[in-house]
């Protein structure tokens, strides 16, 4: 019923932008975007007691205010400030798991290890996960046809700026030992151009963060190489060390077994290296 009240209160009609309008290279706004964001907000705040006082209508007002009527190539972090404020969330700062190019396994891990958090386990990350959105300059319409692509059109688009902003805040809030899950199957295990490499690494606070521990996830069953010696991991170690943060690295040779052992740490096979 709370959700119905919110839908009733909507003042803007969400028309599609006509097809003759500007065409971008990326997919358009996710279908039923306003309803999806509101529904996710209501669900999240019902489940998480520390966010129960958050008003989802205000959250949606702040979200839409960040991109509606604005040119989708001219979005700034400042546009998202009200949303960031309403979505401020105190997660245990020593239980943060960052990830790069291996989202699914990171999420499977935090679903089992419930006291650890990825960005998508927070309200703001949960609201926007896997969604696309953009508007149009000087109209109150959402563009369901196309949205700017980061490479082909512009980097300051609503989705990219959102993730940059929320990722920076998430990294800034971290403390003690921060973990990052990296994909060992990729040519660049650590990619300076990823959100982790370009935003999160540079916003960890040395006065709060003691160590960044990388977990390199192996893809092949027979892959016994020490991927912690990979040149890109050495590059990450160098960046982190220069920021006066300690660095450590672990190979996760068997991600399936790794998850199984997180679920059942008493299992006798879990004492050997995973």
């Amino acid at each position: 019923s709370g959700l119905n009240d919110i839908f009733e209160a909507q003042k803007i009609e969400w028309h599609e932008v006509p097809r003759w309008r500007q065409q971008w290279s990326g997919p358009g706004t996710t279908k039923r975007f306003p309803e999806t964001v509101l529904a996710r907000c209501v669900k999240y705040t019902e489940i998480h007691p520390e966010m129960r006082h958050v008003d989802c209508q205000s959250v949606w007002d702040a979200f839409k205010g960040a991109f509606i009527s604005k040119h989708p190539c001219n979005i700034t972090e400042e546009d998202y400030q009200p949303l960031m404020k309403l979505g401020t969330q105190t997660v245990p700062c020593n239980k943060i798991l960052l990830w790069s190019r291996i989202k699914d396994l990171a999420h499977q891990f935090t679903q089992v290890q419930r006291d650890m958090f990825t960005l998508e386990d927070t309200l703001l990350g949960y609201l926007a996960d896997d969604l696309t959105w953009c508007g149009e300059f000087n109209t109150s319409k959402i563009n369901y046809q196309s949205c700017p692509d980061w490479r082909k059109d512009c980097s300051n688009n609503p989705v990219s700026v959102f993730w940059k902003t929320v990722s920076r805040r998430f990294a800034e809030a971290a403390c003690d030992v921060v973990h990052v899950m990296l994909n060992g199957s990729r040519s660049k295990i650590f990619d300076k151009n990823s959100t982790f490499g370009s935003v999160e690494v540079h916003n960890l606070q040395p006065e709060k963060v003691q160590t960044l521990e990388a977990w390199v996830i192996h893809g092949g069953r027979e892959d016994s190489r020490d991927l912690c010696q990979d040149p890109t991991i050495k590059e990450l170690e160098s960046i982190i060390s220069k920021r006066n943060i300690q660095f450590s690295c672990k190979n996760i040779y068997r991600p399936d077994k790794f998850l199984q052992c997180v679920k059942n740490p008493e299992d006798s096979s879990c004492t050997s290296e995973i």
Partner: antibody, heavy 121, light 110 residues
């Protein structure tokens, strides 16, 4: 110079209503959160409500203020309002408006305050 | 509800004394360090002294310092000056953008 000036306080009967004003000058009004904070006589500080109006109004409230208190803004007058209904004796306090520090690393703190206006119920 | 507990509630000191005020939060503040300190004199509005637990606000003398993280914080005045006799409040920032203030510590002349 940044200035915030509250007005509209006074004596009101229990169950009555009052509208407080906070007139701002010396800064770009739309780019800051304005927060209402109150202080009962001889007591500590308590936040009431917050508003930000870059395009539309975005506002939120302390749990205890929801339903009875409403914050609004008139950008043409550079003024924020606090409408207080169903007032009780425990609402007696000096009501301050304050401007939050600007910038992502500084939100959550109040750098500029008005002189306050006393509401007696 | 979030509670911020300050101690002591009153503190008597002489000019030149070192003074420490403690603030405990019932929940961790945002980012582990999103806590501010304010000074208030009778009949005046509060004035920001410290933000993010240990950062001095503009124009605040260096005899003021702050420390702590998570739920426990302290404000220290290394050598109390006549202008420092006032009431001090801590203020935390929490989930959903909410705020809470401590009950205050009055620093008076011994």
């Amino acid at each position: 110079e940044v200035q915030l000036l509250e007005s509209g306080g006074g004596l009101v009967q229990p169950g009555g209503s009052l509208r407080l004003s906070c007139a701002a000058s010396g800064f770009s009004f739309n780019n800051y959160w304005i927060i209402w904070i109150r202080q009962a006589p001889g007591k500590g500080l308590e936040w009431v409500a917050a508003i930000y109006s870059p395009s539309g109004d975005i506002k939120y409230y302390a749990d205890w203020a929801k339903g009875r208190f409403t914050v609004s803004k008139d950008n043409s007058k550079n003024t924020v309002y606090l409408q207080m209904n169903s007032l009780r004796a425990e609402d007696t306090a000096v009501y301050y408006c304050a401007r939050e520090l600007s910038g992502a690393s500084y939100e959550g703190y109040f750098e500029s305050w008005g002189q306050g206006t006393l509401v007696t119920v | 509800d979030i509670q911020l507990t300050q101690s002591p509630s009153t503190l008597s000191a002489s000019v030149g004394d070192r003074v420490t005020i403690t603030c405990r939060s019932s929940q961790s503040v945002y980012g582990h360090n999103w806590l501010a300190w304010y000074q208030q004199k009778p009949g005046k509005a509060p004035k920001l002294l410290m933000y993010r637990a240990s950062n001095l606000a503009s124009g605040v003398p260096s005899r003021f310092s702050g420390s702590g993280s998570g739920t426990e914080f302290t404000l220290t005045i290394s050598s109390v000056q006549p202008d420092d006799f006032a009431t001090y409040y801590c203020q935390g920032y929490y989930s959903g953008g909410s705020y809470a203030f401590g009950g205050g510590t009055k620093v008076e002349i011994k």
